[in-house]
Amino acid sequence: FVRTKIDTTENLLNTEVHSSPAQRWSMQVPPEVSAEAGDAAVLPCTFTHPHRHYDGPLTAIWRAGEPYAGPQVFRCAAARGSELCQTALSLHGRFRLLGNPRRNDLSLRVERLALADDRRYFCRVEFAGDVHDRYESRHGVRLHVTAAPRIVNISVLPSPAHAFRALCTAEGEPPPALAWSGPALGNSLAAVRSPREGHGHLVTAELPALTHDGRYTCTAANSLGRSEASVYLFRFHGASGAST
């Protein structure tokens, strides 16, 4: 299930005045598409161009991150007169052209979504042959990937003065809220660190001082679900053990 965000500002500004018989270069992409991790998403992209009945060689390209300079994630080429766009690049084999570039449609399907796919994507078409021309969406479509929480790391670490602290790192979108529970803790939100730069979906919570032996449980929760993991502290054994 894919939701396309309607940009109210765009709609407000989008009052058609006259229709124009001759097209010019333009690209239409929604501001945002949302889908869940593990699912597939469709990134719509249609275009108009000034070259009537163009039938020459063309290349369709999608890039990620930034316009013009971002890395390509998909590229295909269609020979003169052909409606088949032969895939030349599909990053990790997860990108597939849904649209027909000959019919001004570059829509792309992204399979097996991961949180790392949460980026802005830019479509581009290039004409070669009799006509040499190209156009790229400047604003792009933001792929918003949502995911239930997953605890990626839970550990007990030594602290100064023979003490111990516990760390719990989870990922999810929306970023999950983390809570620790354990001996003499009740439920504690315990020093949640903000998502780190470049790791926007990761959240870390620290228990700075473990005062009692026993089981400490980290719970990560967001609107899509929850996840738990535990560590065990046995100081009388002179060591700590972890179980997830």
Epitope: E16, S19, S20, R24, S26, P67, R138, H139
Partner: antibody, heavy 116, light 108 residues
Framework: QLQLQESGPGLVKPSETLSLTCAVS???????WSWVRQPPGKGLEWIGE???????TYKPSLKSRVTISVDNSKNQLSLKLTSVTAADTAVYYC???????????WGRGTMVTVSS | SSELTQDPAVSVALGQTVRITCRGD??????ASWYQQKPRQAPQLVIY???NRASGIPDRFSGSISGNTASLTITGAQAEDEAAYFC???????????FGGGTKVTVL
């Protein structure tokens, strides 16, 4: 609501560097942003643009003298124009590109005079 | 010289129709946008892309494009429409933006 505010020295000496900033408030800086100038009594001249990712494009005749950058943490963009002459005297505007090549939000502009 | 050419000035009687033109080879490939600028004010977007009105712009303003010419038409001009009007688009290479020289509209 989105507002843009240009700021910088109103007077710059010839051969020096003109430095302006544009503060973006009321919205994310995730977009394309342009600097446009207007000499007194004349038309608009596009200087260049920057995407929030740092990609830039400059007017070819100014390219050797101009640098446009964006500071996402401060929600501002900046313009640097080196080796200025009297011909660079103008009102300088920053503007947001909301659709391909169309600017829907403009700052009020700041007047910069190049004179010794 | 600008890659987009506009007539320096036009006048129109109150309530009448005026058409402002913008010419340039790049307009065969790219859409034009139009801006209104009143004295001591920043420009304001009027028409963009495939002849779409910007937010808050009255429907007496309309746009069209044909060949290498983009046009802005004010049907039933009002006193408050007296201003300079600028067009902008891409250059012929598509690599950067250009503005027309502007047209001063006087409402008589």
């Amino acid at each position: 609501q989105l507002q843009l505010q240009e700021s910088g020295p109103g007077l710059v000496k010839p051969s020096e560097t003109l430095s302006l900033t544009c503060a973006v408030s009321g919205a994310s800086i995730s977009n394309w942003w342009s600097w446009v100038r207007q000499p007194p009594g004349k038309g608009l001249e596009w200087i260049g643009e920057v995407h929030h990712s740092g990609v830039t494009t400059y007017k070819p005749s100014l390219k050797s003298r101009v640098t446009i950058s964006v500071d996402n943490s401060k929600n501002q963009l900046s313009l640097k124009l080196t080796s200025v002459t009297a011909a660079d005297t103008a009102v300088y505007y920053c503007a947001r590109e909301f659709a391909d090549d169309a600017f829907d939000i403009w700052g009020r502009g700041t007047m910069v005079t190049v004179s010794s | 010289s600008s890659e987009l050419t506009q007539d320096p000035a036009v006048s129109v009687a109150l309530g009448q129709t005026v058409r402002i033109t913008c010419r340039g080879d790049s307009l065969r490939k790219y859409y034009a946008s139009w801006y209104q600028q009143k004295p001591r004010q920043a420009p304001q977007l009027v028409i963009y892309h495939k002849n779409n009105r910007a937010s808050g712009i009255p429907d007496r303003f309309s746009g069209s494009i044909s060949g290498n010419t983009a046009s802005l038409t004010i049907t039933g001009a009002q006193a408050e429409d007296e201003a300079a009007y600028f067009c902008n688009s891409r250059d012929t290479s598509g690599n950067y933006l250009v503005f027309g020289g502007g047209t001063k509209v006087t409402v008589l």
